[in-house]
C-alpha cells in the first residue's frame, strides 16, 4: 500500500505591527512538533493595512474597525478555519503611539481600547494590544534576524542557507529605522555596557548573550524631517524656507500648526510671524547633510563614548542587518548592493538630490509625490545617522547589510515578539531527538 501523507500538523500566529506611518499584519506558520527548534517558524503572509498609522485615528477611533477589516479578513482566508480559535493574535504599537501617549495617555488608551475591541470580534485567540517599549522593539528585531539567519543554532553547517551567513555563530547587530524612532542593537565585544538602561541579558538555546540596545525616539525618518524643518524655520528670514534636502524646483506649503503638532519639535518651537511657510527645494546633498547633523548633539557624553544626545554606544562589532526603512529607502535608491561602497552611496545621493523635481516626477510617475519628494532627505538622513550618529566608517560600511527579507520572512521586530510570547525560544538547547515517529506512516 502507498504511504499517505498525514494532515499537516501546523500552528499559526498573527502579529500586527502598528507603526507610526502604517500597520502591517504578519501571519507565521510552524510545524507543531518542532516548536522549540530554531529556524522553523516562517512568514506565510504580510498584509499591509490600507491607510496611515493607528495614532492618526485619535479623532475618529470608531473607524479603526473598518481600517483593520481587510487584513483581518485576509488572515481568516489564509489560516484554515479549524485553526482559527487556537491562533494567537498580538498587536504591538511602536513609536507613533509612544508619541501620542506622551501627548495624552487618555487618547492613547482610547485608541488601543478600540483596537482591542475590533480585534476581539474575530474568531482568533486575541492576546492583547499594547505599546511596546523602544528597548523591546530593538531586542525583538535582533532576535528576529538572528533566528532567521540561524545564529542560535548550535549545529554548524558546512553550507550556507542564507545569503548573509558567515558560517559562524557570531550574531548580527540589528539596525531598525521607522517613521518615528530608530533602534540599534548588537552584542559588543568584551565591553561593559556602561549604562544599565541599554543592557539586556538573554539566555537562548543554552547560550548567554549580553546585548546593547537603544531606541532613539523622534529620530525615525518622518519625525527627523519634522525636527529639521522646525530647526531651520527658526532662522528663516521670511516664510520661504530654501531647503537643500528637497529637489530643485520642488515647492510645498507647510502649516506651522502641523509642524508643532508632534512632541518631537517642541524643543524648536517658537512664535513665528506667519501661519504657513513654503519649502523651496535647492537639492544640495552636502548642505542637507550639514543641516541634519545639527539634530545630533555630540557635544555632551557622560560615558567613554556616545552615539549622540548623551546616549552610550559601545564600539561597533561584527556585521549588522539594516532593515525596515533603512532597507526600503536604500532599495528605492538602488543602493542595497553589498558591492556599493559608502563613498559610492554618497556620490549617488549627491546626484539624486541635485536632480530637478520635474525630472524626478517624470522618472518615477508611479510613486506618490509626498513619498517621492522625501527620498533625498531620507537617503541623506540614513547616511548621516549611520556615519555620524552610530560611527560607522567607510571601512565598516561593508559590514552593513540592507535586508528586506530573510528566508522569505520580513526582517523586523514582529517575529521575535511572537517567538517570545509563545515561548518558542527556549533558554536551554533542546535535546536533539531522532525523527519524530509521526513523520512517516
Amino acid at each position: 500500500t502507498q504511504n499517505k501523507a498525514l494532515p499537516e500538523n501546523v500552528k499559526y500566529g498573527i502579529v500586527l505591527d502598528a507603526g507610526s506611518s502604517h500597520t502591517s499584519l504578519y501571519i507565521y506558520k510552524w510545524p507543531a512538533e518542532k516548536e522549540n527548534d530554531t529556524g522553523v517558524v516562517h512568514q506565510v503572509e504580510e498584509c499591509r493595512v490600507k491607510g496611515p498609522g493607528i495614532s492618526k485615528f485619535v479623532q475618529k477611533v470608531n473607524e479603526i474597525g473598518i481600517y483593520l477589516t481587510d487584513c483581518m479578513e485576509r488572515a481568516r482566508e489564509v489560516i484554515p478555519r479549524s485553526q482559527h480559535q487556537e491562533t494567537p493574535v498580538y498587536l504591538g504599537a511602536t513609536a507613533g503611539m509612544r508619541l501620542l501617549r506622551m501627548e495624552s495617555e487618555e487618547l492613547a488608551d482610547r485608541v488601543l481600547d478600540v483596537v482591542e475591541r475590533s480585534l476581539s470580534n474575530y474568531p482568533f485567540d486575541f492576546q492583547g494590544a499594547r505599546i511596546i517599549t523602544g528597548q523591546e522593539e530593538g531586542a525583538y528585531g535582533w532576535i528576529t534576524i538572528n533566528y532567521l539567519l540561524g545564529k542560535f543554532s548550535q549545529k554548524t553547517r558546512w553550507f550556507s542557507i542564507v545569503p548573509y551567513e558567515t558560517n559562524n555563530q557570531e550574531t548580527f547587530g540589528a539596525l531598525d529605522l521607522g517613521g518615528a524612532s530608530t533602534q540599534v542593537t548588537f552584542v559588543p565585544q568584551n565591553q561593559t555596557i556602561e549604562s544599565p538602561d541599554n543592557a539586556l541579558q538573554f539566555r537562548l538555546y543554552g547560550k548567554d548573550y549580553n546585548v546593547y540596545t537603544h531606541s532613539f525616539l523622534c529620530y525615525g525618518k518622518d519625525q527627523a524631517l519634522w525636527q529639521k524643518l522646525a530647526k531651520d524655520i527658526q532662522v528663516a528670514s521670511n516664510e520661504i524656507l530654501r531647503d537643500p534636502c528637497f529637489h530643485p524646483g520642488y515647492k510645498k506649503v507647510v502649516n506651522v500648526s502641523d509642524l508643532y503638532k508632534t512632541p518631537c519639535t517642541k524643543r524648536f518651537e517658537m512664535t513665528l510671524p506667519f501661519q504657513q511657510f513654503e519649502i523651496q527645494g535647492i537639492g544640495n546633498y552636502q548642505q542637507c547633510h550639514q543641516s541634519i547633523l545639527e539634530l545630533f548633539n555630540t557635544s555632551y557624553c557622560p560615558y567613554s563614548q556616545c552615539a549622540f544626545n548623551g546616549i552610550f554606544l559601545p564600539p561597533l562589532q561584527g556585521d549588522f542587518g539594516a532593515f525596515s526603512a533603512f532597507y526600503f529607502v536604500m532599495k528605492f535608491l538602488n543602493l542595497t548592493s553589498e558591492k556599493v561602497s559608502q563613498e559610492k552611496v554618497t556620490e549617488m545621493m549627491k546626484k539624486f538630490c541635485a536632480q530637478p523635481w520635474e525630472e524626478i516626477k517624470t522618472s518615477y510617475a508611479g510613486v506618490k509625490e509626498k513619498y517621492l519628494s522625501e527620498y533625498c532627505f531620507s537617503g541623506t538622513y540614513i547616511l548621516s545617522l549611520l556615519l555620524q550618529g552610530y560611527h560607522f566608517t567607510a571601512d565598516s560600511w561593508e559590514h552593513i547589510h540592507f535586508i528586506g527579507k530573510i528566508q522569505g520572512s520580513d526582517a523586523g521586530w514582529t517575529l521575535g515578539y511572537m517567538l517570545n510570547l509563545t515561548n518558542m525560544i527556549p533558554a536551554e538547547q533542546p535535546l536533539s531527538t531522532p525523527l519524530s515517529h509521526s513523520t512517516y506512516v
Epitope: 504580510e46 498584509c47 499591509r48 490600507k50 491607510g51 496611515p52 492618526k56 485615528f57 479623532q59 475618529k60 470608531n62 473607524e63 474597525g65 473598518i66 481600517y67 477589516t69 481587510d70 479578513e73 485576509r74 481568516r76 482566508e77 470580534n121 508611479g366 510613486v367 506618490k368 509626498k370 513619498y371
Partner: antibody, heavy 121, light 106 residues
C-alpha cells in the same frame, strides 16, 4: 486628487476575450486595493474581485472565478481585468474603484467612469 | 456570502418629506456603507461606516443601525435626492451590495 481612467466601450462577439484597463493617478499605486464591479444595464451592482498592488494578491467573488482575471502593471499604474469566453450575460458596465483611508485618516471612495462592454453576435 | 435586502424597492416621496430606506443583512455585519447613483454615472459614496457622511454630502442625510438592520434617512427630501441608493457591506468577502432602492418623482 485620485483619478481612475478606464478604457473605452467595447463591442465583442460571444466566445471572444476582452481586456479592460483602469489607469490610476494622484496616489501611490501600491497603497490601496483596486476593486472591479459589474453593473448590467443600470441594475444591481456586483463585486467581481480585487487586487492588492502591494502584494500582488487577488480575491474573486466565486461567481466570477475562472473566466475573469485581474492583473496590474505597476510600471504604468494600471490595473486590468480580462474576461474570457464571453457570453451575452457579460454585457454590462464595468467599474474599477478603490477606497480606504488617506494619510490624514480621511475615508475616500473613488470610481472610474465605467467601461461599457457589449457582447453580441 | 452575506445577502443584503433593501426595502422598499421603489419609493415616490414628495419634496420636503422624510424618507427612510432600510437594508437588512442575512448575517451580522460591522458597518454599512451607502451609495447614490444617478443614470449614466458611477455610484458615489454617500454614507460610510454606518453613520458618517462622505465629503460634501448634505446634513439632511443620516445613517444608523447595527448587526443586521441598517437605515439611511433623508430628513427633508429635495429634488436633487431622486436617485437609486445602494447599501454595501465590506465586513467580509465577497463584498456585496443590496439590490437598490429607487427614489423616483411621483
Amino acid at each position: 486628487e485620485v483619478q481612475l481612467l478606464q478604457s473605452g466601450a467595447e463591442v465583442v462577439k460571444p466566445g471572444a476575450t476582452v481586456k479592460i484597463s483602469c489607469k490610476v493617478s494622484g496616489y501611490s499605486f501600491t497603497d490601496y486595493n483596486l476593486n472591479w464591479v459589474k453593473q448590467p444595464n443600470g441594475k444591481n451592482l456586483e463585486w467581481i474581485g480585487n487586487i492588492d498592488p502591494y502584494s500582488g494578491g487577488t480575491r474573486y467573488n466565486q461567481k466570477f472565478k475562472g473566466r475573469f482575471t485581474i492583473t496590474i502593471d505597476q510600471s504604468i499604474n494600471t490595473a486590468y481585468m480580462q474576461l474570457n469566453s464571453l457570453r451575452s450575460e457579460d454585457t454590462a458596465v464595468y467599474y474599477c474603484g478603490l477606497y480606504g483611508y488617506d494619510d490624514d485618516a480621511n475615508y475616500f471612495d473613488d470610481w472610474g467612469q465605467g467601461t461599457l462592454l457589449t457582447v453580441s453576435s | 456570502e452575506i445577502v443584503l435586502t433593501q426595502s422598499p424597492a421603489i419609493l415616490s416621496p414628495s419634496p420636503g418629506e422624510r424618507v427612510t430606506l432600510t437594508c437588512s443583512a442575512s448575517s451580522s455585519v460591522s458597518y454599512m456603507h451607502w451609495f447614490q447613483q444617478k443614470p449614466g454615472k458611477p455610484p458615489r459614496l454617500w454614507i460610510y461606516a454606518t453613520s458618517n457622511l462622505a465629503s460634501g454630502i448634505p446634513a439632511r442625510f443620516s445613517g444608523s443601525g447595527s448587526g443586521t438592520e441598517y437605515t439611511l434617512t433623508i430628513s427633508r427630501m429635495e429634488s436633487e435626492d431622486f436617485a437609486v441608493y445602494y447599501c454595501q457591506q465590506r465586513s467580509s468577502y465577497p463584498l456585496t451590495f443590496g439590490q437598490g432602492t429607487k427614489l423616483e418623482i411621483k
